[in-house]
Amino acid sequence: ESSNQASLSCDRNGICKGSSGSLNSIPSGLTEAVKSLDLSNNRITYISNSDLQRCVNLQALVLTSNGINTIEEDSFSSLGSLEHLDLSYNYLSNLSSSWFKPLSSLTFLNLLGNPYKTLGETSLFSHLTKLQILRVGNMDTFTKIQRKDFAGLTFLEELEIDASDLQSYEPKSLKSIQNVSHLILHMKQHILLLEIFVDVTSSVECLELRDTDLDTFHFSELSTGETNSLIKKFTFRNVKITDESLFQVMKLLNQISGLLELEFDDCTLNGVGNFRASDNDRVIDPGKVETLTIRRLHIPRFYLFYDLSTLYSLTERVKRITVENSKVFLVPCLLSQHLKSLEYLDLSENLMVEEYLKNSACEDAWPSLQTLILRQNHLASLEKTGETLLTLKNLTNIDISKNSFHSMPETCQWPEKMKYLNLSSTRIHSVTGCIPKTLEILDVSNNNLNLFSLNLPQLKELYISRNKLMTLPDASLLPMLLVLKISRNAITTFSKEQLDSFHTLKTLEAGGNNFICSCEFLSFTQEQQALAKVLIDWPANYLCDSPSHVRGQQVQDVRLSVSECHRT
């Protein structure tokens, strides 16, 4: 017991932490002072009626990853204030409704990863009227969803069901929940997908399918009996798909009349881009989908891809596309031309070079595009990049950060409406007239700049942290500046006069520099009460670098002696 007790530390607010120890039972002596109790990653196997009896003010109880196989019936009887209960990844093979009955305040319940076959004989959650987040199921033994399982639940913010090995689904089991903001469904096989889909289409706003093999998925007409689908977003995460089954998935998505957003994360496409519909399949209507997000798409036979043209017509209404970290080196010109409504395109962490980008940004490509993100691609020339994008007449925001440009030419051409340019982490060591004068926001942080002397008459925000600047930029060159972030440079001082010369400045972040704490600098920074409103990282990030005897101290706290300040 005493070693158990020693493994637990509580602060004055009643937050008690005892995770990742060698506890084999809940420590004794817990009182009403305990508000939060984290005993995750221990070796607790048994919870008795008396363990938590006095914890009447307990709001959070985390018991994940122990070896709990038994919870006595009345173990939680005094936990009427409990809001958060995590029993995930234990050895609970039978769930009892008596555990949850007293938990009238519960908003979060996690029962994932316990070896139960079903959610019990009676409705477990019917008394949990305040429940917002519920996680149930496991990877292997949870095989059956019953009609009574979710009875009594009317609204959930998030429902996660690990039904990886689901073999039986009683119709209408999920229909009883009137509204679920986000349903996450883990299913290895797709056999019961359509049955579940029918039940959730009118109650779920965001549907997320995880870990499913859809290679052989075939859509058959649904008998929904109603067409008012609530689903606004459908996410496929770690899902396997083929050319043919993608077409089948699109037919399923056709059933969702109000679908606005489609997302594929960590998916595998086992295909070569052969999306031609067979003759008896009617043309797919993309409906109202405005946002398409693809992250880390794996295409094993990527270099065999040959014809995406059957998909082009589906893209005309899409407004936002993200294809991130998916080895994209070319967007076909014809596809770009079909993306007539596209306003936002994010191709971060891909393989684009200027010469292939030119093919993508061909004449009439992306006519509505306002934001283009090409962060961390293979761009190497600012001049070529700017020139390549001249076809994009409405482009205002460009992020080409994390490309290695190294140098910057004296002049460049850019789309004429440009307002935002991100050149952070591009290894540039100087800024020149290549930067367009129309900019309102410029980010050149994390580079090798030791000088910034550009006249940017419309610039409102300058992000130039993590460079090698020794002084603030000349305010007269930036007459409209509102925000200046210049932390972690080599600035040793700045004066009242310098700050006052930025007439419009509202926010300055200049911490993390090597300040020489002269009497003048200390006097100015310590006496200006208004300074704290402008310096958003004051006082914590403003440390003296010299004189040596005050090095590391906060500027606001340093006091120099009279003799130091009145030397003749």
């Epitope: 065999l304 970290n325 070319l330 010109c333 014809l334 994390k402």
Partner: antibody, heavy 118, light 111 residues
Framework: QVQLVQSGSELKKPGASVKLSCKAS????????INWVRQAPGQGLEWIGW????????NFNENFKDRATITVDTSASTAYMELSSLRSEDTAVYFC???????????WGQGTTVTVSS | DIVLTQSPATLSLSPGERATLSCRAS??????????MQWYQQKPGQPPKLLIF???NVESGVPDRFSGSGSGTDFTLKISRVEAEDVGMYFC?????????FGGGTKVEIK
């Protein structure tokens, strides 16, 4: 500047394995692919395979699929290529090269000579 | 596999002459309007050096006397005025289909 520095020459007996290294500098290692190409004496170039350090994904020429393994140590910005069950026909200079734009090899290592002889 | 056939096997030129090297692919290397064909130069004892990518894009730092053209299956590398330093082997390479393949090479020598 971009550099790929390869390990030194190797003399191996038939049936043995060889593991070659390629240390990258001057660029963000995880952003680019690394390819391996070989050139037998007086012959042309033969593509072996690639790896993308960011996710560890690989692709191989079928001729090498069973014998070649390509790995990376991202913390050391180094790629490795191991070739097993060596035979005399594997005597060649082995090059690593940076893959840019998904399609072309813009920087090459100096090459490692592997001689397989009994 | 896509087979790349280069011709001629050897090209012997005087300084200042124009060199035309050819590479023919057994099938198209087009990819949505871009030809995925590269040209490399290799001097004895050195690794190959990229000259041209995407059939016609000259790699940065490569002298402008080098140019590439072609589409589909037929590609050409031209050296407008050959110089002594241009001697070596020239290889074409396709990255349209796996496995990536190289041509057998053309040897350029100065008379």
């Amino acid at each position: 500047q971009v550099q790929l520095v390869q390990s030194g020459s190797e003399l191996k007996k038939p049936g043995a394995s060889v593991k070659l290294s390629c240390k990258a500098s001057g660029f963000t290692f995880t952003t680019y692919g690394i390819n391996w190409v070989r050139q037998a004496p007086g012959q042309g170039l033969e593509w072996i395979g690639w790896i993308y350090p960011r996710d560890g994904s690989t692709n191989f020429n079928e001729n090498f699929k069973d014998r070649a393994t390509i790995t990376v140590d991202t913390s050391a910005s180094t790629a490795y290529m191991e070739l097993s069950s060596l035979r005399s026909e594997d005597t060649a200079v082995y090059f690593c090269a940076r893959l840019t734009g998904g399609t072309f090899l813009d920087y090459w290592g100096q090459g490692t000579t592997v001689t397989v002889s009994s | 596999d896509i087979v790349l056939t280069q011709s001629p096997a050897t090209l012997s030129l005087s300084p200042g002459e124009r060199a035309t090297l050819s590479c023919r692919a057994s099938e198209s290397v087009e990819y949505y309007g871009t030809s995925l064909m590269q040209w490399y130069q290799q001097k004895p004892g050195q690794p190959p050096k990229l000259l041209i990518f995407g059939a016609s894009n000259v790699e940065s730092g490569v002298p402008d006397r080098f140019s590439g053209s072609g589409s589909g299956t037929d590609f050409t590398l031209k050296i407008s005025r050959v110089e002594a330093e241009d001697v070596g082997m020239y290889f074409c390479q396709q990255s349209r289909k796996l496995p990536w393949t190289f041509g057998g090479g053309t040897k350029v020598e100065i008379k």
